[in-house]
Interface confidence: low
């Protein structure tokens, strides 16, 4: 679980979307709960389907798979998982908050031609070498980027990841997710990990009973959750006494 400590809130949110885990905003008080959910998802996935040892098919760190035991934290979701995120029937208006896109998942996709990278899909024989010292803060965006979001995007939808069909067969594949489309003249739109499923996905409130122990003790929070509750309780009691004495005064004006 400590592997997720280096992830920014933005990156954690992206993982939640990728794994199709219903979530609200990632903040200090909810972070540990989400880390736990992601950990459980990845653990379960590895248990159900052992990692494929085949080489990756792209120019991305993300696709550098490895057969080493210490590398399995860095595998992509299987193609079956990725297909969930690309369901054509998905029409929810769940808003993509980060990574420089402002589209909703229900928008049509571009059928434009793929460019340079798509034409030369490669595999990396040195994936193991890359993976053996990788930690989880090697990610594309730090949390500061969340503040810069609503700008024009810079990467294109029409890249090596436009179609999932040119990857290995489902049985032994790892595939990356679709890039989202954003129509700009610069052929550029930063990729957004869509995590939609075949059924509609809506935001759900985080229920206290689902929290991991100590989930309330967020990194950003200066006053712990129990402290806030205590303060609130004191505040309520003070208000009650004020109300009580005011009522008493009204009853006996002399």
């Amino acid at each position: 679980m400590d592997n997720y400590a280096d992830l920014s809130d933005t990156e954690l949110t992206t993982l939640l979307r990728r794994y199709n885990i219903p979530h609200g905003p990632v903040v200090g008080s909810t972070r540990r709960l989400y880390e736990k959910k992601i950990f459980e998802y990845e653990t379960q996935r590895r248990r159900l389907s052992p990692p494929s040892s085949s080489a990756a098919s792209s120019y991305s760190f993300s696709d550098l798979n490895s057969t080493r035991g210490d590398a399995d934290m860095y595998d992509l979701p299987k193609k079956e998982d990725a297909l969930l995120y690309q369901s054509k029937g998905y029409n929810d208006d769940y808003y993509e908050e980060s990574y420089f896109t402002t589209r909703t998942y229900g928008e049509p996709e571009s059928a434009g031609p793929s460019r340079a990278v798509r034409q030369s899909v490669t595999s990396f024989p040195d994936a193991d070498a890359f993976h053996h010292q990788v930690h989880d803060d090697d990610l594309l965006s730090s949390s500061e980027e969340e503040c810069k979001d609503r700008e024009r995007p810079m990467y294109g939808r029409d890249s090596a990841y436009q179609s999932i069909t040119h990857y290995r067969p489902v049985s032994a594949s790892r595939s990356s997710l679709d890039l989202s489309y954003y129509p700009t003249s610069s052929s550029t739109s930063f990729m957004s990990s869509s995590s939609s499923s075949s059924s509609w996905l809506t935001r759900r409130a985080i229920r206290p009973e689902n929290r991991a122990p100590g989930a309330g003790l967020g990194q950003d929070r200066q006053v712990p959750l129990w402290g806030q509750l205590l303060l609130f309780l004191v505040f309520v009691i003070v208000l009650f006494f004020i109300y009580h004495f005011m009522q008493a005064e009204e009853g006996n004006p002399f």
Epitope: L7, E11, T14, L15, R18, S58, Y59, S60, F61, S62, D63, L64, M73, Y74, D75, L76, Y99, R115, A116, V117, Q133, V134, H135, D137, D138, L139, L140, S141, S142, E144, E145, M154, Y155, G156, D158, S159, A160, Y161, S176, L177, L179, S187, T188, F190, M191, S193
Partner: nanobody, 122 residues
Framework: DVQLVESGGGLVQAGGSLRLSCATS????????MAWFRQAPGKEREFVAG????????YYTDSVKGRFNITRDNAKNTVYLQMNSLKPEDTAVYYC???????????????WGQGTQVTVST
């Protein structure tokens, strides 16, 4: 529009050194992992070295470990590849690009830069 511009390549004798630079314009890339790739004639483009967004983690392909060093200067929006003890097999066109791991697969520019030619003579 974001552009990647690689520079610093050239002709060098085996055992020599070069320092490649990758400058970006159009948007700060300080929040993104970056990587160097290379493509030798008749071969596929391959990963050489990577650095995470904070600069705290670096990754290398086996063949360059101990010889190459990737660094970044986020203030200058530039990524560097210091190449020492160069070998003839390091001859290739070197490209830089955005790279990342499991959270955001495939996050790199559609159009690669021109690259910079590195030629190592015997």
């Amino acid at each position: 529009d974001v552009q990647l511009v690689e520079s610093g390549g050239g002709l060098v004798q085996a055992g020599g050194s070069l320092r490649l630079s990758c400058a970006t314009s159009g948007r700060s890339l300080s929040s993104y992992a970056m990587a160097w790739f290379r493509q030798a004639p008749g071969k596929e483009r391959e990963f050489v070295a990577g650095i995470n967004f904070s600069g705290r983690r670096t990754y290398y392909t086996d063949s360059v470990k101990g010889r190459f060093n990737i660094t970044r200067d986020n203030a200058k929006n530039t990524v560097y590849l210091q190449m020492n003890s160069l070998k003839p097999e390091d001859t290739a066109v070197y490209y830089c690009n955005v790279g990342g791991r499991k959270v955001l697969a495939g996050t790199f520019f559609n159009d690669w830069g021109q690259g910079t030619q590195v030629t190592v003579s015997t």
